[in-house]
Interface confidence: low
Amino acid sequence: DAHKSEVAHRFKDLGEENFKALVLIAFAQYLQQCPFEDHVKLVNEVTEFAKTCVADESAENCDKSLHTLFGDKLCTVATLRETYGEMADCCAKQEPERNECFLQHKDDNPNLPRLVRPEVDVMCTAFHDNEETFLKKYLYEIARRHPYFYAPELLFFAKRYKAAFTECCQAADKAACLLPKLDELRDEGKASSAKQRLKCASLQKFGERAFKAWAVARLSQRFPKAEFAEVSKLVTDLTKVHTECCHGDLLECADDRADLAKYICENQDSISSKLKECCEKPLLEKSHCIAEVENDEMPADLPSLAADFVESKDVCKNYAEAKDVFLGMFLYEYARRHPDYSVVLLLRLAKTYETTLEKCCAAADPHECYAKVFDEFKPLVEEPQNLIKQNCELFEQLGEYKFQNALLVRYTKKVPQVSTPTLVEVSRNLGKVGSKCCKHPEAKRMPCAEDYLSVVLNQLCVLHEKTPVSDRVTKCCTESLVNRRPCFSALEVDETYVPKEFNAETFTFHADICTLSEKERQIKKQTALVELVKHKPKATKEQLKAVMDDFAAFVEKCCKADDKETCFAEEGKKLVAASQAALGL
């Protein structure tokens, strides 16, 4: 359904409020360093133009593509060259190359100050003084720090952000009401951003086929009663939505996501019995709810998979006739029977099945060749099961902080070239798998743990891609999307690494550590731990534990001292000397 004016079409479909919010998100995700006021000005100009096109779709420039309109607008920014350097060269290109160029310059780790939360009264005053600007600023700050955040979902977060302030700024104890809500939104927002980043990496680095395979597996687990053709339709539509959002086409993405939610709710009888509550909600909540909906119950009468995919004499004929449809059916049938498997495991099984058919269908006796293919699945299933069992035992024994420390040591020894902040961030997130997943019963542990680890390891991959320092990281990140976690798990200590020179400054601490939150204090200690391992990669667990215990005692002692700064200076020197002796530095 071609429209004379794409911008008018999207404005009418989305409404002015969502249109403006999405254009702001798009601009902030592209030009991450631009001041808020500059973006608001650009958005207002685009909005006024869109209104002229709604009034008359034949008006000048209304027939231009959204990329052309938005790119032209971004290229009017006066300080583009000074602020963004070579990104300004994008403006010399024509569409679609210009948009591709902007996409390539998105920065997963922009050099922006940490968001500091003002006092509650200050925030409430700002909210009441100008609610619209306050909420726009939220969208802007999140979007520029998370250039791949799923835009329609960010609208949902903004709606919850507004609701929190509306409720809590009237409460007797504003802080008690507001702060837990803001913490929850922050944590959920980081998780949502990381999950979407994996989807975009999957599409951009491994292609549409990889994303579609992931979607077939996940939707088949979630909607096991749906027919294969129904799942295929949902996968096609979902792929379009995410391709658009990952490609910066946020208006189309939000519009198509709304259409998909509408379709799912109109057809829930042939999709899932779990959708009823979701489908009664307003649009943003509905889409979020559908994306998070629990798995439907498996049909009780599913026959054995072997009949169609192993015992049948026609396997090779069916495979040859339509490879991707046949493999899609295999993945669908396997996934709907295995909500207890991670998506990445299901994809490994499908890949093994595909490799076997490629080999066997060219053999003298294909059936004899592929007859035992299901036996090859056993070790693939057992590997993550055993790993999760061992790590959950370790988590239960150590607790989250010490479990994170164990992972910090493990990963620093595997890839010591990676920057310390990245190792700390990634290992802390890897360590959160314990509290997130180990509480679940066996049947839910693997999908929770391994699919979460895929998201976290993707963070490592995208951060490392910006400044590549380790061939081992590059190899694990680029060879196979579904084998990233096994690849990192299999890495041993990097024997080629030359230890870092000892620098006392790295281990010098000041009284400001005493005023930090518990989380910030942990990060300081974990940063020191990574640096220790980089200096002494062969240090034993016991040696590292002894040094870290001494360090914790030192911080506690000096934070209780009357003259904290003197304590940190004097006791710090002793601690460094003792640590050097303990580690043989």
Partner: nanobody, 115 residues
Framework: EVQLLESGGGLVQPGGSLRLSCAAS????????MSWVRQAPGKGPEWVSA????????RYAESVKGRFTISRDNSKNTLYLQMNSLRPEDTAVYYC????????SSQGTLVTVSS
Amino acid sequence: EVQLLESGGGLVQPGGSLRLSCAASGFTFGSFGMSWVRQAPGKGPEWVSAIDSGGADTRYAESVKGRFTISRDNSKNTLYLQMNSLRPEDTAVYYCTIGRSASRSSQGTLVTVSS
């Protein structure tokens, strides 16, 4: 919306014949293999017959071989099952499905074979 609508069932005497039809909509019918599945009262579903997307390759359960014929007309988005020499044990609700899944999302059509 994916829809499968079966018709053609009814009461027939042993040795008689029936032709079932399944009208498909909401998906690219010609791209998918199709099957007939049946469920007798108080029993689980039983796969009956399958046909590939082009209609060249057909397969049958041992219990119906030589008596039933599956076919399709992709121009009409319709799947057929010609049932000859019907027996009382063929009494069941017959469903068409996509692929060879024995799960079902349609209403089915009742076939009763009785004297």
